[in-house]
Interface confidence: low
């Protein structure tokens, strides 16, 4: 790359009136070679009588420069711009610990100015992620951490996360948080967060996807409240009462645990047997009263009804006509009825 031309370049060029030192309007920027595509480095300086590139401390051949020159209308100073092309082969042929670099050197009558070093690197992105996310089953509202360390690459890969192929935007959904080291945090897992999550690494060379991590948000079952105790199932004597509950508060979901414990509880109960009422025998007929009737009675006490037993059917009191005893018979008139 050395050329005798550059050995003869003076430190300054005699000129009148004196010029300022060259000032870089544009400095070369770092560049990446993708596959076999060469890169262009470009710089621009004013005032500049000469401008050339130096790469890895060696001058680039004059014929490899594309130079343009013009006069700045406002300042009247000469503006020079230059570009060179760097191939993959050139970068690969460099031996030593340092990366391939180039810098611009511009001259004016006042002296020389060097631009910053622009590094030229071969871009790549390895295929294998250094850490891939781990699928998990998590309970509702639990925090979930999905880790991702992207494959090694130049330039360093950017990372984004996909939820079922859709890009996660933590600004849009505040339940997601992406840490500085590319981990995805689901702050409180929701049922809607049950999905396939993929870490995507990309740079100018390629885009790589991690293996998919399946996150399943499960719900453990919870018991409903107990029903009221049933009535004793025996109408008479020993039996049981029961109450029930169901595993529906909530029902288990996505492989969540079924409720532990009993869904039915029973307790012993004793119901007093009902006793139906029965009549006592009729009493003797009473003596015949003044109204020519006599009566007899009985009571529902042999036994009396108990514990919801049936009452006795029929009359407590019976009366009928009589004509003996104190019965006073009178002739019938329109107001009286004789009882026989």
């Amino acid at each position: 790359q050395d050329d005798d031309f550059f050995h003869e370049l003076p430190e300054t060029f005699p000129s009148d009136p004196p010029e300022p030192l060259p000032h870089f309007l544009i400095e070369p920027e770092e560049a990446y070679i993708v596959k076999n595509k060469p890169v262009n480095l470009y710089c621009k300086a004013s005032p500049a009588t000469q401008i050339y590139f130096k790469c890895n401390s060696e001058w680039v051949h004059q014929k490899d420069h594309i130079v343009d020159e013009r006069v700045d209308e406002t300042s009247g100073l000469i503006v020079r711009e230059v570009s060179i092309e760097i191939s993959r082969q050139q970068v690969e042929e460099l031996f030593g610990p340092e990366d391939y670099w180039c810098q611009c050197v511009a001259w004016s009558s006042a002296g020389t100015t060097k631009s910053r070093k622009a590094y030229v690197r071969i871009a790549y992105l390895r295929k294998t992620f250094e850490q891939e996310p781990l699928g998990k089953e998590v309970s509702l509202e639990q925090e979930v951490l999905l880790q991702c360390r992207p494959p090694e690459g130049i330039p360093v890969a950017e990372v984004e996360w996909l939820k079922n192929e859709d890009i996660i935007d933590p600004v849009e959904d505040r339940n997601f948080y992406i840490t500085i080291d590319h981990n995805l945090i689901i702050k409180q897992a929701r049922l809607s967060d049950t999905a396939n999550y993929t870490c995507v690494a990309k740079n100018i060379v390629a885009k790589r996807k991690s293996t998919t991590a399946t996150v399943i948000v499960y719900v453990n079952g919870g018991w409903s409240t107990w029903t009221e105790w049933s009535v004793c199932n025996s109408r008479c004597g020993r039996g049981y009462q029961k109450r029930t509950r169901t595993c529906t508060n909530p029902a288990p979901l996505n492989g969540g645990a079924f409720c532990e414990g009993q869904s039915v509880q029973k307790i012993a109960c004793t119901t007093l047997c009902p006793v139906d009422g029965r009549w006592t025998p009729w009493s003797k007929w009473s003596t015949c009263g003044t109204e020519c009737t006599h009566w007899r009675r009985r009571e529902c006490t042999a036994p009396a009804p108990k514990n919801g037993g049936k009452d006795c059917d029929g009359l407590v009191l019976q009366s009928k006509n009589c004509t003996d005893g104190l019965c006073m018979q009178t002739a019938p008139d329109s107001d009286d009825v004789a009882l026989y």
Epitope: Q131, E132, L134, G135, K136, E137, S139, T212, T214, G255
Partner: antibody, heavy 119, light 107 residues
């Protein structure tokens, strides 16, 4: 009660492929993470990898280039293939169920099967 | 990978003793830690998950504590059936890794 049972040859020749199957009974293969773990004689436990019934796999990077884990939900079993084996792969191989939750504990294990790599 | 370091690697104790096993992670793993018991010729058995939750059917003399990088398994009163090897396991990130084990022997 969930039960896991490993099956496969107890002797494999160097450079060949080790193949094991784990049959799951008493429960569904769905919604869990099914792992293979091995233990060389007199040594500690080493996780090989897992598969979810969705087909998602995750392998130990130290074995990744040689491991394949697959699942057959219709037969309720999952399988391990480890290629290019050497004597260093001699171990008791366990299949285990990862119960999920954030800490992925292995709550059910097979009884283990000893695989010897020898010519 | 996250390294899990258990200590001690073995200990001798008597029935009725209080036994403590520690597990240290090479980086913070929150509460993503499980403990297992393994007896010779048998598969490991889950004792504690999520650092401190007791697995169903495990006696209450087993308890777990800790968060971040330092965790402890405690057996409050050692029983004859507790002589075994105990392992911790992290699931903060893959690859899932186990501690080297602590063998509890009869004094």
């Amino acid at each position: 009660q969930v039960q896991l049972q490993e099956s496969g040859p107890g002797l494999v020749k160097p450079s060949e492929t080790l193949s094991l199957t784990c049959t799951v009974s008493g429960g569904s293969i769905s919604s869990y993470f099914w792992s293979w773990i091995r233990q060389p004689p007199g040594k500690g436990l080493e996780w090989i990898g897992y598969i979810h019934n969705s087909g998602t796999t995750n392998y130990n990077p130290s074995l990744k280039s040689r491991v394949t884990i697959s699942v057959d939900t219709s037969k309720n079993h999952f399988s391990l293939k480890l290629s290019s084996v050497t004597a260093a792969d001699t171990a008791v191989y366990y299949c285990a169920r990862g119960r999920g939750m954030a800490t992925l504990p292995f709550d059910y294990w097979g009884q283990g099967t000893l695989v010897t790599v020898s010519s | 990978d996250i390294q899990m370091t258990q200590s001690p690697s073995s200990l001798s104790a008597s029935v009725g003793d209080r036994v403590t096993i520690t597990c240290r992670a090479s980086q913070s793993i929150s509460s993503y830690l499980n403990w297992y018991q393994q007896k010779p010729g048998k598969a490991p058995k889950l004792l504690i998950y999520a650092a401190s939750s007791l697995q169903s059917g495990v006696p209450s003399r087993f308890s777990g504590s800790g968060s971040g990088t330092d965790f402890t398994l405690t057996i409050s009163s050692l029983q004859p059936e507790d002589f075994a090897t105990y392992y911790c396991q992290q699931s903060y990130s893959t690859p899932l890794t186990f501690g080297g084990g602590t063998k509890v022997e009869i004094k």
